[in-house]
């Protein structure tokens, strides 16, 4: 019996088609993805093949103005329109708190939303009961398939799930649910979840009875053969893991941003064993037409976004200096504003010993593309912020050793004076450079804000200590020559859309007046 699994993950609000790098579509003939194009391909496969499931492995929320404005209603609407069969909760589904998940998505979705390792307690338990499930048994043709969900247990550090949701260890939580499915005579089981490729592989290895793992969170691109675009495969598709009980378990993920549709064909025997698995992600490029009815619906929903872009978010009473003449040479107040917003967006008081789990921010000066003039009545709009941060990136959480941070700050000024983009703006860091010294030895003082303290203060950076840092995904991926970050990072979790982080901060503060205050000397 053959099952076709179509899957997406980490779509992050890319409802409209995007450019090849998943930023805003400029030249339509070269654009990719989007729900209208996805629907065309899904329907094509549904018509051609008998047993098809369309699954999403989480993080539909967060990433473009679509989420900023519609707050998840757009996810429910368009996923319903595409007739998704199931979705796993990702960490970003909690970005607007539990209410921001329940009202727009859980109550509106016509498909099951799953996570076995999230347990509700207190008053939330009854409120959320039945709105998400640990597993769902789906009829497919003449067979049944069990889908069991899971979500990163790091979610409390990455998002805003509140205090009434407990995130358990994935493997510990999944095993009893899979065992329950087995007692219900469900012998074909897919683990669908959002904990990253390493955890996906562990689930395949450790959870008895899981036949296939469909994952997300790590934006992993897998491919067999010559890849069709710029993404470099992390392994073959599917990636085969040998389970502890000797089975070959296919593990898949489909990169991110709706650029690809994962396509996996699984052959099951009478006992529900996987006899064979093959496929590849399908690049959703312009050779696939956008479905006209979904496209028309997108255009209808788009109108509200254009209006939102010009509305006032807040005011500035000072010039926000985002000029390259400042931000690529010295501390600039636009850099300070953005870093302060980045830290503010990551306030999570999850431990009494820590005032916060992260205190540091770094930001490449070259990523700041425009100033904002306060003489326009001080008004700041989304449109203004889009000029400052035009690349559609995210502000991510990484864990780095002190020694890696030291290398990064040396790189920041290794060719100082040439107006290059790698000059770092900071938050929660005091750095002193001596530019008369030779490159690679210019950082003379590097103090960082403590986290395990009730009164935050600056202490010297320790080379062997592991620090959490918020930074642009561009830097996490080694951009602007920061190869040491990419090579040496110990953990990387993708965060919120850059403009959204700054806009939320400005809306919260109402009036801003960032200063140049001696963070960089």
């Amino acid at each position: 019996w053959e099952l076709t699994i179509l899957h997406t993950n980490d779509v992050h609000s890319r409802l409209e088609q995007t450019s090849e790098d998943s930023s805003k579509c400029v030249n339509a003939s070269r654009c990719m993805g989007g729900v209208a194009r996805l629907f065309t391909k899904v329907q094509q496969i549904r018509r051609a093949e008998p047993n098809v499931l369309l699954l999403d492995a989480g993080d539909q929320y967060q990433g473009t103005i679509w989420f900023t404005v519609y707050k998840g209603a757009e996810v429910a609407h368009f996923m319903n329109a595409l007739r998704y069969d199931a979705m796993a909760l990702g960490n970003h589904e909690f970005d607007n708190g539990v209410e921001g998940l329940i009202e727009p998505l859980l109550k509106e979705a016509k498909f099951p939303i799953l996570s076995a390792n999230i347990k509700a307690k207190g008053p939330l338990a009854s409120q959320i009961s039945g709105l998400y499930l640990p597993y769902k048994v789906l009829p497919v043709g003449d067979e049944v398939v069990g889908i069991v969900g899971y979500t990163s247990k790091e979610t409390p550090f990455l998002s805003n799930p509140g205090t009434n949701l407990v995130f358990e260890d994935e493997i510990t939580a999944l095993q009893p649910e899979v065992d329950k499915l087995k007692t219900l005579n469900v012998n074909k089981i897919i683990a669908l979840g959002h904990s990253g490729f390493e955890m996906d592989k562990l689930i395949a290895q450790k959870v008895r009875g899981v036949d296939v793992v469909v994952g997300g969170h790590s934006n992993t691109f897998l491919y067999t053969g010559n890849p069709p675009s710029k993404e470099v495969p992390a392994g073959k598709y599917p990636f085969i893991v040998t389970s502890d009980d000797g089975r070959k378990v296919p593990v898949v993920q489909a990169y991110a941003f709706g650029k690809y549709l994962g396509y996996l064909k699984i052959e099951f025997d009478e006992r529900g064993n996987v006899i064979s698995s093959h496929g590849n992600p399908i690049l959703l490029n312009s050779s696939i037409p956008e479905d006209p009815s979904i496209k028309a619906d997108i255009n209808k929903w788009r109108i509200k976004l254009d209006n939102y872009s010009t509305q006032e978010l807040g005011k500035t009473i000072v010039y926000l200096d985002g000029s390259s003449q400042s931000c690529r040479f010295r501390e600039c107040n636009m850099g300070n504003l953005i870093c302060d917003a980045m830290i503010n967006n990551n306030l999570r008081h999850t431990d009494e010993m820590f005032w916060n789990h992260v205190s540091m921010c770094i930001l490449n000066g070259g990523g700041i593309r425009s100033p904002i003039d306060e003489r326009n009545n001080g008004t700041i709009t989304w449109e203004n912020l889009a000029a400052v941060l035009p690349f559609g990136g995210t502000f991510d959480l990484v864990q780095l050793k002190g020694s890696t941070l030291k290398k990064a700050f040396e790189h920041s000024v290794h060719r100082y004076g040439q107006s290059t983009g790698e000059f770092l703006q900071v938050g929660g860091i005091h750095v002193v450079y001596d530019l008369s010294r030779k490159p690679g030895d210019r950082v003379v003082k590097l103090d960082v804000l403590c986290t395990k303290c009730r009164v935050p203060s600056y202490d010297p950076l320790k080379m062997d200590e592991v620090y959490k840092v918020i930074l642009p995904n561009f830097l996490a991926n080694g951009g602007d020559g920061f190869q040491m970050i990419k090579d040496e990072l110990l953990r990387h979790d993708s965060g919120d859309q850059d403009i959204n982080v700054v806009s939320t901060y400005i809306s919260k503060m109402k009036v801003i007046y960032p200063a140049v205050e001696g963070r960089i000397k």
């Epitope: 019996w1 043709g141 003449d142 067979e143 005579n185 040998t242 000797g246 070959k248 025997d269 009478e270 006992r271 064993n273 996987v274 006899i275 064979s276």
Partner: antibody, heavy 113, light 106 residues
Framework: EVTLKESGPVLVKPTETLTLTCTVS????????IQWVRQPPGKLLEWLGV???????DYNAAFISRLTISKDTSKSQVVLTMTNMDPVDTATYYC???????WGQGTLVTVSS | DIQMTQSPSSLSASVGDRVTITCRAS??????LNWLQQKPGGAIKRLIY???SLDSGVPSRFSGSGSGTEYTLTISSLQPEDFATYYC????????FGGGTKVEIK
């Protein structure tokens, strides 16, 4: 639990027709095929034929003229019919799942006058 | 038709021995190979499917490997209950079996 059980006569006279039934439980004949295999005493396993989930059948070329495999999906039963039986057809007859994950216990059919 | 050549046809071994049985296909069968165990009573049980995946309840001392036309069943440490006849079965085309390997007590 997934099981297969063969039933039918233990003794068949030469030139007669053998009819064996394989009763399936734990999976659907709409989704999976059934294979038939036989093993003469002390000899090797020999594939006879298969009926697929869609209802079509394939046969070992050596038996194509005298073998028919059919099914009644509603009863979860598959029937093997072999005409013109000969003493050399004496064997244990097995039905098995399409992928060989499950086997019947086998039924010994003796062809003798 | 795809032919399966299995060797050896029989072997004598002691408890604790490592046993290897091989099957060669007349053409590439792309991992579509099962290993079956038949006990003296006639009952047939699949041990390994898709070349190397272990069936539920089968001890981990059994393992399978191979690709293309060459396939191997290994019993890492022979146990008393393992004395039986083993067959390879290809299902890339119409089923064909290897000639069997009878594993006897030395």
């Amino acid at each position: 639990e997934v099981t297969l059980k063969e039933s039918g006569p233990v003794l068949v006279k030469p030139t007669e027709t053998l009819t064996l039934t394989c009763t399936v439980s734990g999976f659907s004949l709409k989704s999976y095929g059934i294979q038939w295999v036989r093993q003469p005493p002390g000899k090797l396993l020999e594939w006879l034929g298969v009926i697929w989930s869609g209802g079509s059948a394939d046969y070992n070329a050596a038996f194509i003229s005298r073998l028919t495999i059919s099914k009644d999906t509603s009863k979860s039963q598959v029937v093997l019919t072999m005409t013109n039986m000969d003493p050399v057809d004496t064997a244990t007859y097995y039905c098995a799942g399409q992928y060989g994950s499950v086997w019947g216990q086998g039924t010994l059919v003796t062809v003798s006058s | 038709d795809i032919q399966m050549t299995q060797s050896p046809s029989s072997l004598s071994a002691s408890v604790g021995d490592r046993v290897t049985i091989t099957c060669r296909a007349s053409q590439d069968i792309g991992d579509r190979l099962n290993w079956l165990q038949q006990k003296p009573g006639g009952a047939i049980k699949r041990l390994i499917y898709a070349t190397s995946s272990l069936d539920s309840g089968v001890p981990s001392r059994f393992s399978g490997s191979g690709s293309g036309t060459e396939y191997t069943l290994t019993i890492s440490s022979l146990q008393p209950e393992d004395f039986a006849t083993y067959y390879c079965l290809q299902y890339a085309g119409s089923w064909t079996f290897g000639g069997g390997t009878k594993v006897e007590i030395k």
